[in-house]
């Protein structure tokens, strides 16, 4: 019984053409939605001419949905097993579930003045950039729509810029009508263990962000895993959101819709300093804002943002350090709402349920060049925002599955 | 160590155009900005504009804006400074020199308009 | 636009004297001021730069003090070959903009 369970198994989460698990690859069956809570900063003013604080408020949620549209160009390679794919990137608002509009207003770090002054750290240039800075009439925070927040706008102080420079700033842009990919994955045709392991993305086995080991694309995309995951397994994983490979460990049974699944989540040490997790060592890339490597909980990622200082953290700063969160009023981070799991069917690895949980940051630093900087004393790291993207199997899907698979086994 | 080696001496008809240049050595060009100042004589320092070698990025003084442009050649680490419609008052010494604060001087190219 | 008014424009000593040249700004610059000597054919030459720095090499009777928008160069103990044009340039903000300059004199 168990052995032909086992085959029917193997046999159905092979991702090629006629397999359950490939029609559920190929475009998911489940609805996933992406919900922001906008960081609106309160005391504007204060920030920019006292260095005081930055006083948050969280706004939300807007959701959108997400993930629905299927994967292109897929396309089989037979000779080494793998199939390769873009996932296209798309998202709807969803008024009914959003605490608002996509024209409603917040009061944001401004992203071109923060990612402008730290690109450019020769000081000429940066006399340059405040001229044209108050020719626009520009500041530390800027007042925008959740659209322009998130999927963009034409900024006025890069309108000036005198040479090309893009123009349009906002956290996710480009994002409709774009790709992420190419990915290339196993298709466990010869090897069941290795199916929906990333071979290689955009074309490399490496990321060319890190140093070292933290460099290595791991795993899956975190959708599926290789069959028969045992509690004690760490599942390795790859996120482009996070320009990363991450991994997480086993926390508790859950029973979901009746189909009983281990409950992964993302461990505080995947957060950690370099102090407490050595491993982490190549993921501290620079010495003066980590403080030499010492702070913990925030990721650098600008080497895969064109150098825009973009750091990414669990949302409220969850398990990162508390020099980190000092400068910043009004975050509660806790562990249920803000952390990252994944509920995994451990005999099919399927992801049935998941939450990703992730908060997008930016560094300013002061600047005596730059007028609206000029007055600070200290960096800061500053919440833009946070995400909480989420999906669970269908009630119908559940049913089928619960037929099909965890049925036939018990 | 560093030097700033401009271009000789030059005299030009009114309306025409002077291209002076400056060659760096002793140190990475694109590394600091490239300033020129020009002295009429007897006169004070005036600022005319700067170029960042790096990133392009380039400052003129508004009194030259529109005649004036400046160039960098990163490959013979060489700033160049044109002023276009030229006329008498343009007579001047004419120095590229290093960085914001000016650490290092070319010795200065004499442009002289005259009919 | 910066300007910066420069003042005595002509000054006179004797080699022992101290001599200020004054310097005030229409903006707060902090300390982005420099101070540069020049000597007749030749190009002008960096004593203290932004900070009140002394460059490397200037003789230690130079000095400069000053923030925001009035600023002092001080010569203590003038000698002989001191006998030069003196300016100040503001570094804080663009366009960059000088002094008119300061005529020092040794009897």
């Known amino acids: 019984g168990d052995l032909l369970i086992q085959k029917t198994i193997k046999k159905q989460v092979v991702l090629e053409e006629g397999t359950i698990a490939f029609k559920n690859w190929v475009k998911t069956g489940t609805e996933v939605y992406r919900q922001f809570w906008i960081f609106d900063v309160q005391n504007p003013q204060e920030v920019m001419m006292n260095s005081s604080n930055i006083q948050v408020k969280q706004r939300g949620p807007y959701t959108y949905r997400v993930r629905f549209l299927a994967k292109e160009n897929v396309t089989q390679d037979a000779e080494d097993n793998t199939v390769s794919f873009l996932q296209p990137n798309g998202a709807i608002f969803e008024p009914s579930l959003s605490v608002g509009t996509e024209a409603d207003n917040f009061t944001v770090l401004n992203l071109a003045v923060a990612a402008a002054s730290h690109i450019y750290q020769n000081q000429f240039v940066q006399m340059i950039l405040n001229s044209l800075i108050n020719k626009s009439k520009s500041s530390m925070f800027q007042v925008r729509t959740l659209r322009e927040l998130l999927w963009g706008y034409r900024d006025p102080f890069l309108s000036l810029v005198p040479y090309p420079v893009t123009t349009t700033v906002g956290l996710f842009y480009p994002y409709n009508n774009t790709a992420d990919g190419v990915y290339k994955v196993f298709n466990g045709k010869d090897n069941i263990s290795k199916v929906a392991i990333i071979d290689t993305y955009k074309g490399k086995r490496n990321l060319s962000y890190w140093e070292s080991h933290c460099d290595m694309i791991n795993g899956t995309d975190a959708a599926s895993f290789p069959p028969f995951v045992e509690k004690s397994q760490v599942l390795q994983f790859f996120s482009s959101d996070i320009c990363r490979s991450i991994y997480a460990v086993f926390e508790s049974d859950v029973n979901l819709k009746g189909i009983p699944v281990y409950r992964f989540v993302l461990p505080s040490k995947a957060f950690a300093s370099p102090v407490e997790n050595p491993d982490n060592y190549c993921f501290c890339t620079e010495k003066i804002i980590s403080k030499n490597c010492t702070s913990y909980g925030v990721l650098d990622i600008s080497k895969c943002k064109e150098g825009r200082p973009v750091y990414i953290s669990l949302p409220h700063f969850l398990y990162a350090s508390p020099d980190v969160s000092e400068p910043i009023d009004g975050l509660n981070p806790n562990e249920e709402e803000h952390r990252t799991y994944l509920d995994i069917e451990p005999i099919t690895g399927f992801t049935l349920q998941f939450a990703k949980r992730l908060q997008v940051n930016l560094l300013v630093k002061p600047s005596e060049k730059i007028q609206v900087l000029k007055n600070l004393k200290r960096n800061y790291i500053v919440p833009i925002l946070w995400l909480n993207e989420t999906g669970t199997i269908g009630d119908e899907k559940a049913n089928m599955f619960r037929s099909q698979v965890t049925g036939k086994i018990n | 160590q560093v030097q700033l080696v401009q271009s000789g001496a030059e005299v030009k008809k009114p309306g025409s155009s002077v291209k002076v240049s400056c060659k760096a050595s002793?140190?990475?060009?694109?590394?600091?900005?490239m300033q020129w100042v020009r002295q009429a004589p007897g006169q004070g320092l005036e600022w005319m504009g700067g170029i960042d070698p790096e990133t392009g990025g380039i400052a003129y003084a508004q009194k030259f804006q529109g005649r004036v442009t400046l160039t960098a050649d990163k490959s013979t680490s060489t700033a160049y400074m044109e002023l276009s419609s030229l006329r008498s008052e343009d007579t001047a010494v004419y120095y590229c020199?290093?960085?914001?604060?000016?650490?290092?001087w070319g010795q200065g190219t004499l442009v002289t308009v005259s009919s | 636009e910066t300007t910066v008014t420069q003042s005595p424009a002509f000054m006179s000593a004797t080699p022992g004297d101290k001599v200020t040249i004054s310097c005030i700004t229409s903006?707060?610059?902090?300390?982005?001021m420099n101070w540069y000597q020049q000597k007749p054919g030749e190009p002008p030459k960096l004593l203290i730069s932004?900070?009140?720095t002394l460059r490397p090499g200037v003789p230690s009777r130079f000095s400069s003090s000053g923030y925001g928008t009035d600023f002092t160069f001080t010569i203590n103990n003038i000698e002989s070959e001191d006998a030069a044009y003196y300016y100040c340039l503001q570094s804080d903000n663009l366009p960059l903009t000088f002094g008119q300059g300061t005529k020092l004199e040794i009897k």
């Open positions: 020199t290093r960085k914001l604060d000016f650490d290092y």
């Open positions: 932004e900070g009140n």
């Open positions: 903006t707060d610059i902090d300390d982005d």
């Open positions: 002793g140190y990475r060009f694109s590394d600091y900005e």
